[in-house]
């Protein structure tokens, strides 16, 4: 027989299958051009001295063989004597070590057995009604296919699934979507309606994240507020990495989980932009304001659960950095300016009230005045800080107020609103005899004492009604009692107390008259 022909004679070896575990397997035969065909197979076991024979039986019952030698691939033409338009049965017999090993048979029509490719190029993955939808372009000239998929998770073996018949320029498959674990998918195709056609190779892995991205388990710490009024947010613990199936380890496009940091600046609600989203790797500097921080995990199917923290405001106060002058036209604040063209946000809220009741005002960008100060003024009619109570004031500054992470804290302090000098007047002044020439003066704490750092001191004034002599006694803001000594019996005195702030002299309390009775000896 000629080597190019299928030989219709008995093969040159005895006809007996050894039934050994090794041998030829996975025979695939295809048409590779208009008139040429190729069969290929795998051989399991030692290859030395092995001769392969491709056997073919026609529908008429006549059988022939091609001698392939040691090769595991053989090509022939439509002139080789093999019926290509009708079904034939093919198998491989391998003669080795005086025994014959036989592959499983394939029955097919060679002319219509086109070598099908697996899905090539970009496989688009999307979510559809709780399932996974994969879509790809049908390889050229291969419309009409059966498609299978296999999938595995990091802890499970391959499972096989069916995509059903496909008959279009694009093909698709609905597959199961896991809630909490990543999956690796591979797809393969074979010709539709072609009896016995071989499956293509498996496609490259398609790596699919779980439907729910893993909840980020991270911890933050916030550094102390620096001299520049900013504090760094640092990540104490990185998010855990998603466990991946074997074929997705290393480069696994599709399974990436991205973690984003969402900052919400709670303070200064009158600024233009309150939230900003950043990549988790880029840890920002924050002002001393209160923030809510959320870490949002997302994958190609969208965002998952987020983890939220509250970062409280830095309450460190600067008692002397803010000057407040109250005039007939209104009130003006002065503080050391940060730089040229700064926008300031002045926020105030009554002490002891919920943070949600904060009020604020945004200044236009301003340059320092000749004394290097920045200012903010308001009229009495505006009602700002108009009530006679303690307010907590924070001033923030930014050269780029639209950028949330560029705000810094200028100062935080307390201020007593309204007519502080009158409101702060101490009440319930009482005088008690202390000794033959001294008295103890007590009073109720000034309302100013509820405002940390505002009350500078009390001043107690004693007036001798006879000589009209006046003495004044400064008292620490934490004290509400003083002893006046060196007094004379039988003389009428009046005592008054006032409460002073750093920038305002208080109003004297109502005069309290007293005298030390003359002691008559027996």
């Amino acid at each position: 027989c000629r080597t190019s022909e299928c030989c219709f004679q008995d093969p040159p070896y005895p006809d007996a299958d050894s039934g050994s575990a090794s041998g030829p397997r996975d025979l695939r035969c295809y048409r590779i051009s208009s008139d040429r065909y190729e069969c290929s197979w795998q051989y399991e076991g030692p290859t030395a001295g092995v001769s392969h024979f491709l056997r073919c039986c026609l529908s008429s019952g006549r059988c022939c063989y091609f001698a392939a030698g040691s090769a595991t691939r053989l090509q022939f033409s439509d002139q080789a004597g093999v019926s290509v338009l009708y079904t034939v049965t093919l198998w491989v017999e391998s003669w080795a070590r005086n025994q014959t090993e036989k592959s499983p048979e394939v029955t097919l029509q060679l002319y219509n057995s086109v070598k099908y490719e697996p899905p090539l190029g970009d496989i688009k993955v999307s979510k559809l009604a709780g399932q996974l939808r994969m879509e790809w372009e049908t390889p050229d000239n291969q419309v009409g296919a059966e498609v299978q998929f296999r999938h595995r998770t990091p802890s499970s073996p391959w499972k096989l699934g069916d995509c059903g018949p496909q008959d279009d320029d694009t093909e698709s498959c609905l597959c199961p979507l896991e809630m909490n674990v990543a999956q690796e998918f591979q797809l393969r195709r074979r010709q539709l309606g072609s009896q016995g056609s071989s499956w293509s190779k498996w496609s490259s892995p398609v790596c699919v994240p779980p439907e729910n991205p893993p909840q980020p388990q991270v911890r933050f710490s916030v550094e102390q507020l620096g001299q520049d009024g900013r504090r760094r947010l640092t990540l104490k613990e990185q998010p855990t990495q998603l466990e991946l199936p074997e074929g997705c380890q290393g480069l696994a496009p599709g399974t990436e989980v991205t973690y984003r940091l969402q900052l919400h600046m709670l303070s200064c609600p009158c600024k233009a932009k309150a939230t900003r989203t950043l990549h988790l790797g880029k840890m920002p500097y924050l002002s001393g304001a209160a923030y809510n921080v959320a870490v949002i995990s997302s994958n190609q199917f969208g965002p998952g659960l987020n983890q939220t923290w509250h970062i409280p405001a830095d309450t460190h106060t600067e008692p002397v950095a803010l000057n407040i002058s109250v005039g007939t036209n209104g009130t003006t604040m002065y503080w050391p300016a940060r730089a040229q063209s700064m926008t300031y946000c002045i926020e105030w809220q009554p002490v002891g009230q919920d943070g949600g009741l904060a009020t604020c005002s945004l200044t236009a960008p301003q340059d320092p005045d000749p004394a290097g100060m920045a200012t903010y003024s308001w009229s009495r009619e505006s009602g700002a800080m108009g009530q006679e109570k303690c307010y907590y004031i924070t001033i923030f500054a930014s050269a780029h107020p639209e950028k949330l992470t560029l705000w810094s804290t200028v100062l935080s302090t307390y201020h007593f609103g309204g007519n502080a000098s009158a409101a702060g007047t101490p009440h319930h002044v009482s005088v008690k005899n202390h000794s033959l020439d001294s008295v103890s003066v007590d009073w109720a704490p000034s309302l100013l004492s509820t405002c940390p750092g505002v009350l500078k001191e009390y001043v107690v004034r004693c007036r001798d009604e006879d000589s009209k002599q006046v003495s004044e006694h400064p008292v620490q803001p934490t004290e509400t009692q003083v002893t006046l000594s060196g007094l004379r019996a039988g003389v009428a005195y009046t005592v008054q107390v006032r409460a002073d702030t750093a920038w305002l002299r208080g109003v004297w309390s109502q005069p309290q008259r007293f005298s030390i009775e003359v002691q008559v000896s027996d």
Epitope: S34, S60, D78, S83, L85, Y86, Y111
Partner: nanobody, 124 residues
């Protein structure tokens, strides 16, 4: 004497249609596999379509799949080739052939009986 005669060829515009017929005489062709081949100038004869004796199985060359349809009427001893969406590259002499051995091949030399052919010309 045994003979096959093709008809229906001619000039067609690209995108147009033609229907070729192959009438057999001299023997009963209803037991034979039938096929159409074509040969363009300077090229080898190439397989176009095949139909088995019962019209249960048909096969087409990739270049004509979806455009050409082979059929047969055994009572009339005739085989047809319906050609649609014609292209200039379909220009050739079309031959009808019979295979009484039912070998099922695309190799023209395996076919025993042949017609003289009919010219098909497709203009762009």
């Amino acid at each position: 004497q045994v003979q096959l005669v093709e008809s229906g060829g001619g000039l067609a515009q690209a995108g147009g249609s033609l229907r070729l017929s192959c009438a057999a005489s001299g023997r009963t062709f209803s037991n034979d596999d039938m096929a159409w081949f074509r040969q363009a100038p300077g090229k080898e004869r190439e397989f176009v379509a095949h139909i088995d004796r019962n019209a249960a199985s048909t096969n087409y060359a990739d270049s004509v799949k979806g455009r050409f349809t082979i059929s047969r009427d055994n009572a009339k001893n005739t085989v047809y080739l319906q050609m649609t969406r014609l292209k200039p590259e379909d220009t050739a002499v079309y031959y009808c052939a019979a295979d009484p051995d039912h070998f099922g091949t695309t190799w023209y030399q395996q076919y025993t009986y042949w017609g003289p052919g009919t010219q098909v010309t497709v203009e762009p």
